[in-house]
């Protein structure tokens, strides 16, 4: 039975040209996290394997930095980076947990962080 919960940074916004940290946290389960995949809509951004560490998709090597922790830092943001991001936790024995973050990249200098929320 999957008892875990993923907490994410929720709906967030950032300035064009700036950077943002995407974070998820898995709680309420004793399952072992074997790998965390970060995806943007239908593209793979990065993988963090519990044993081997990070893999970054070639098309994002110049703009994605691993961490902090199991999170991901996006740099040199463009308006095209606006959209949904998913953290996918591969765990044993529970299976897969998915968290969602919506990022809005703003042209203006006003970029406020949204509230944190939970996805069961």
């Amino acid at each position: 039975m999957m008892t875990g919960t993923i907490e994410t940074t929720g709906n967030i916004s950032a300035e064009k040209g700036g950077s943002i940290i995407l974070q998820c946290h898995l709680s309420s389960t004793t399952a072992q996290v074997t790998q965390v995949n970060w995806e943007q809509q239908d593209q793979l951004l990065a993988i963090c394997n519990a044993d081997l560490g990070w893999h970054i998709s070639p098309s994002f090597k110049d703009r994605v930095a691993p961490g902090p922790g199991l999170g991901l830092t996006l740099q040199s943001l463009t308006v095209n980076d606006t959209g949904e991001y998913f953290c996918i936790y591969h765990t044993y024995p529970d299976g897969t947990y998915t968290g969602r973050i919506f990022l809005e990249v703003l042209e203006s200098s006003v970029a406020e962080h949204g509230a944190r929320f939970q996805i069961p």
Epitope: L44, G53, S57
Partner: antibody, heavy 127, light 106 residues
Framework: EVQLQESGPGLVKPSETLSLTCTVS????????WGWIRQPPGKGLEWIGF???????SYNPSLKSRVTISVDTSKNQFSLKLSSVTAADTAVYYC?????????????????????WGQGTMVTVSS | DIQMTQSPSSLSASVGDRVTITCKAS??????LAWYQQKPGKAPKLLIY???SLQTGVPSRFSGSGSGTDFTLTISSLQPEDFATYYC????????FGGGTKVEIK
């Protein structure tokens, strides 16, 4: 160019431990990620496990309880031990490199594919 | 575990033919796929990585395409040295290989 060479006994008795060593030349083992893959006669490829230059390991879940991979940076070698072998472990064993690169965060990250392979060594499990 | 299914398992072709091999993943692996060529008694050789990137030194007649679950390796004009077995490999979640496709002389 990086070259890899497997070495070890070609015949192992059932229930014993298979031990192989891979020697890396033309490059330093203190970078990149290093793996073992096997191929039973007439069959496809199966990854066994990996080790990083720092000694972190990742094993195929189906073999995890029997596998140990270690690295000796002073000899530019990494090794495979597979315990409690049976006839099903008869295969050609390959060592290979999984390349890495440095990210914006100055961390080494793995690429996921195997760009340099040893020539393979046949290991038969039989009494 | 992600399963990789290659088709066909074998094919016969002539020198100069255009050859297409497909690989299907049991779930989306985005573009985290590599293709290898293996000749009898030899180690596999990397041809393509990240679904469509040609490895250094590999002839341009080899190309890869696809993303998600469906991938293709194409040899635009088969040469005598291309008769071999070809394997796909995913590295999206764990590492698994396809069953192989043997390309034989017609």
């Amino acid at each position: 160019e990086v070259q890899l060479q497997e070495s070890g006994p070609g015949l192992v008795k059932p229930s014993e431990t298979l031990s192989l060593t891979c020697t890396v030349s033309g490059g330093s083992i203190s970078s990149d990620y290093w793996g073992w893959i096997r191929q039973p006669p007439g069959k496809g490829l199966e990854w066994i496990g990996f080790i990083t230059y720092s000694g972190s390991t990742s094993y195929n879940p189906s073999l995890k309880s029997r596998v140990t991979i270690s690295v000796d940076t002073s000899k530019n070698q990494f090794s495979l031990k597979l315990s409690s072998v049976t006839a099903a472990d008869t295969a050609v064993y390959y060592c290979a490199r999984m390349p890495s690169f440095i990210t914006l965060a100055s961390l080494s990250t793995w690429e996921g594919y195997f760009d340099f392979w040893g020539q393979g060594t046949m290991v038969t499990v039989s009494s | 575990d992600i399963q990789m299914t290659q088709s066909p398992s074998s094919l016969s072709a002539s020198v100069g033919d255009r050859v297409t091999i497909t690989c299907k993943a049991s779930q989306s692996i985005h573009k985290n796929l590599a293709w290898y060529q293996q000749k009898p008694g030899k180690a596999p050789k990397l041809l393509i990585y990240y679904a469509n990137s040609l490895q250094t030194g590999v002839p341009s007649r080899f190309s890869g395409s696809g993303s998600g679950t469906d991938f293709t390796l194409t040899i635009s004009s088969l040469q005598p040295e291309d008769f071999a077995t070809y394997y796909c490999q995913q590295y999206y979640s764990g590492w698994t290989f396809g069953g192989g496709t043997k390309v034989e002389i017609k």
